[in-house]
Interface confidence: low
Amino acid sequence: KSSNEATNITPKHNMKAFLDELKAENIKKFLYNFTQIPHLAGTEQNFQLAKQIQSQWKEFGLDSVELAHYDVLLSYPNKTHPNYISIINEDGNEIFNTSLFEPPPPGYENVSDIVPPFSAFSPQGMPEGDLVYVNYARTEDFFKLERDMKINCSGKIVIARYGKVFRGNKVKNAQLAGAKGVILYSDPADYFAPGVKSYPDGWNLPGGGVQRGNILNLNGAGDPLTPGYPANEYAYRRGIAEAVGLPSIPVHPIGYYDAQKLLEKMGGSAPPDSSWRGSLKVPYNVGPGFTGNFSTQKVKMHIHSTNEVTRIYNVIGTLRGAVEPDRYVILGGHRDSWVFGGIDPQSGAAVVHEIVRSFGTLKKEGWRPRRTILFASWDAEEFGLLGSTEWAEENSRLLQERGVAYINADSSIEGNYTLRVDCTPLMYSLVHNLTKELKSPDEGFEGKSLYESWTKKSPSPEFSGMPRISKLGSGNDFEVFFQRLGIASGRARYTKNWETNKFSGYPLYHSVYETYELVEKFYDPMFKYHLTVAQVRGGMVFELANSIVLPFDCRDYAVVLRKYADKIYSISMKHPQEMKTYSVSFDSLFSAVKNFTEIASKFSERLQDFDKSNPIVLRMMNDQLMFLERAFIDPLGLPDRPFYRHVIYAPSSHNKYAGESFPGIYDALFDIESKVDPSKAWGEVKRQIYVAAFTVQAAAETLSEVA
């Protein structure tokens, strides 16, 4: 049940009052306001929007709203020297050039400062050479190329289709394969849903549309020049050569019209199987190089982007808690966009704005939350989660002592089919209970709960009658809070039907066509899905900030720890002989999980029975719950990834967007059969089992009776 207990309030000021105050019409109005011009990080337009949000949050009634600025490394195209790709003949003449910009959408023809498509942080360069098609440029795609097909990408320019994994992983894989340039493109197989028209007549990607995005491999570092520390006025900055995560080869994105021109001439090897074929009318030959008459033609990249240290601005709003002001519940989402940000991020920012307005309304009527709520409008998320990470680095000591939870609020929608939630297991019960109280916005579920429609449309693969909740990965602003600091985190948005729509993300992601009209005409005309997401995000924040006992259930962590231990054990058991040879045992991990399960169960029993009127005991129990997520942090971090410190979850080493469980063990086991020194490799597996077992046991002990 929701708890109504907060201080200095009349009975009406409960969760229901907060939820009833949220209005779809307001979200629509805010979205329109936030999407009329581009708000690229580091630009004057985005600074002005920061000041507008600061002013409006103050009007809404927050106790304080401040701008927090940092000077970080950003990347922009050269305005007078555009980036493009050409096909050159044997004389070096350019016989085909890719587009320099996307055709602007109707009504936006006269908007200035639309940044042309580019891969942020690409180095400058003009490499030329033969093309190799590398499918999605995943780890397994390069295994297929190099090991099975014996294709050497060294000295080649590779062309990869967007989708499946974070683009930075694609570039890293290409670099490791020896490529000298990367072309990224959107294939209709991934970004054009069958039976839907392209924008402006539908929500599909037109042939001239291009996905922008950063191609860093930061592994949680934040600003590439100041890893671990805030990029403030007295920061000591690394040189570009020592910067974290920058790519070493030129990279550029294109649309499928331009990709067609490059791919139709490809020769060399046929695609290994149908999974390498997209939907263009080309053979999807792997190469290297062009076929037959075109074999003397080469591809040349012309990349002239520059990296610049630029000022960015976060907006931080505070609603002080009445009882525990030193306990922070944070709701944050980014403000910067690649162009108009119709979905990413402004569909999220508009929801945050309305949540702030609702909380402010309650506060003006005399209500305060039990705990402090912090609201954040992050800058430079698109350039590597920079705003959130720098702020968390600056405030890390406060956050690790006082941070209860972080709720992320980027795009509210990526479809309009059902809810999608990724969160710590501590929040499973909170999400279940909350969604049972909310009405479903879905057609055919009138009068039914959100929990019911969500469970029907997205069932849990493990537990019948429950909805799917996914692991947190990365690629968004919760990363520093969860993966580095160990603050319980969650995110929620409305999503597509993954079973029928196989395209990656949503088709117009990071393109100029991500406009207000895209949302208002095609995704959510009534803004009912936005409202539902506001209710979920806002409702979670309300409960986390207001319930007397924190709404965390440690027993759910016990369940997943067992599942993850079983999974990693089964991966290891694919090598039974080596496990025997090198005496690899998971007994310590399973024992720790068993102990955790028993201690969590006893803790939950005590949680039901203790005297909630005793503020000292209440605070003690709540602290045990708050610090449980923190207990999974290893101060030394994961191997070669010091800012990923959570032992149970980390972003996959092969796809930043995806979460991996027991990542230390997983990475130690990955491709272990190819390691040159098996004894050393299996030794590292044993070390990682030891670290995981110790961490689970140590976390369990934080839940034991204190004396």
């Epitope: 397994e140 295994f143 297929k144 090991r147 099975d148 097909m149 014996k150 020769g267 060399g268 090897s269 046929a270 695609p271 290994p272 199987d273 149908s274 999974s275 053979p283 030959n285 190469g287 290297p288 190089g289 076929t291 037959g292 008459n293 074999s295 694919k574």
Partner: antibody, heavy 115, light 107 residues
Framework: EVQLVQSGAEVKKPGATVKISCKVS????????IHWVQQAPGKGLEWMGN????????TYAEKFQGRVTITADTSTDTAYMELSSLRSEDTAVYYC????????WGQGTLVTVSS | DIQMTQSPSSLSASVGDRVTITCRAS??????LNWYQQKPGKAPKLLIY???TRHSGVPSRFSGSGSGTDFTLTISSLQPEDFATYYC?????????FGQGTKLEIK
């Protein structure tokens, strides 16, 4: 050591269907495409199609399209080739092969189609 | 479909001879070409891939060359165990296609 072990010889009547298995060992099954190749008595090699066991993606030669179905069972590390509407000219040895360069081959399965 | 034509269809040679088999593609296949050896009652064995790269364990007397449409397999000094049928195969585009084979017999 990579091994591909195929099911035994079959005698079928015209119009019938044959299903041949190919059990692999010595590598992770989902890592390599599996191809099927036909060789009629005294004749050359003819590629029939392939499957990516990782996702079930298949590609078939036009000559066999509609009659051939290639499947893979990742739980048993086994690939299957089913050929329907058999005729006398389908009498042949059928091979499975794996690795993009057809590095490893099964021992072959003789299918005789006779009334 | 890409047609692969081998020549000769058969040839007789003696131990120690140098033998060359050619394979012609009906259209450009780059260097996406394999050579196989097959003995009676046995499965084919990969000899050469990417037109000129010897598969592991293949003796150095076997070599491949060519690109585009014309390819050759050369056996520098025939050994008794080399008498077999040899096939080329393109993997530039689907359907993957084989040559009709060259039968190498003892003179």
């Amino acid at each position: 050591e990579v091994q591909l072990v195929q099911s035994g010889a079959e005698v079928k009547k015209p119009g019938a269907t044959v299903k041949i298995s190919c059990k692999v060992s010595g590598y992770t099954f989902t890592e390599y495409t599996i191809h099927w190749v036909q060789q009629a008595p005294g004749k050359g090699l003819e590629w029939m199609g392939n499957i990516n066991p990782n996702n079930g993606g298949t590609t078939y030669a036009e000559k066999f399209q509609g009659r051939v179905t290639i499947t893979a069972d990742t739980s048993t590390d086994t690939a299957y080739m089913e050929l329907s509407s058999l005729r006398s000219e389908d009498t042949a040895v059928y091979y499975c092969a794996t690795g993009w360069n057809f590095d490893y081959w099964g021992q072959g399965t003789l299918v005789t189609v006779s009334s | 479909d890409i047609q692969m034509t081998q020549s000769p269809s058969s040839l007789s040679a003696s131990v120690g001879d140098r033998v060359t088999i050619t394979c012609r593609a009906s259209q450009d296949v780059g260097t996406a070409l394999n050579w196989y050896q097959q003995k009676p009652g046995k499965a084919p064995k990969l000899l050469i891939y990417w037109a000129s790269t010897r598969h592991s364990g293949v003796p150095s007397r076997f070599s491949g060359s060519g690109s585009g449409t014309d390819f050759t397999l050369t056996i520098s000094s025939l050994q008794p165990e080399d008498f077999a049928t040899y096939y080329c195969q393109q993997y530039n585009s689907y359907p993957l296609t084989f040559g009709q084979g060259t039968k190498l017999e003892i003179k």
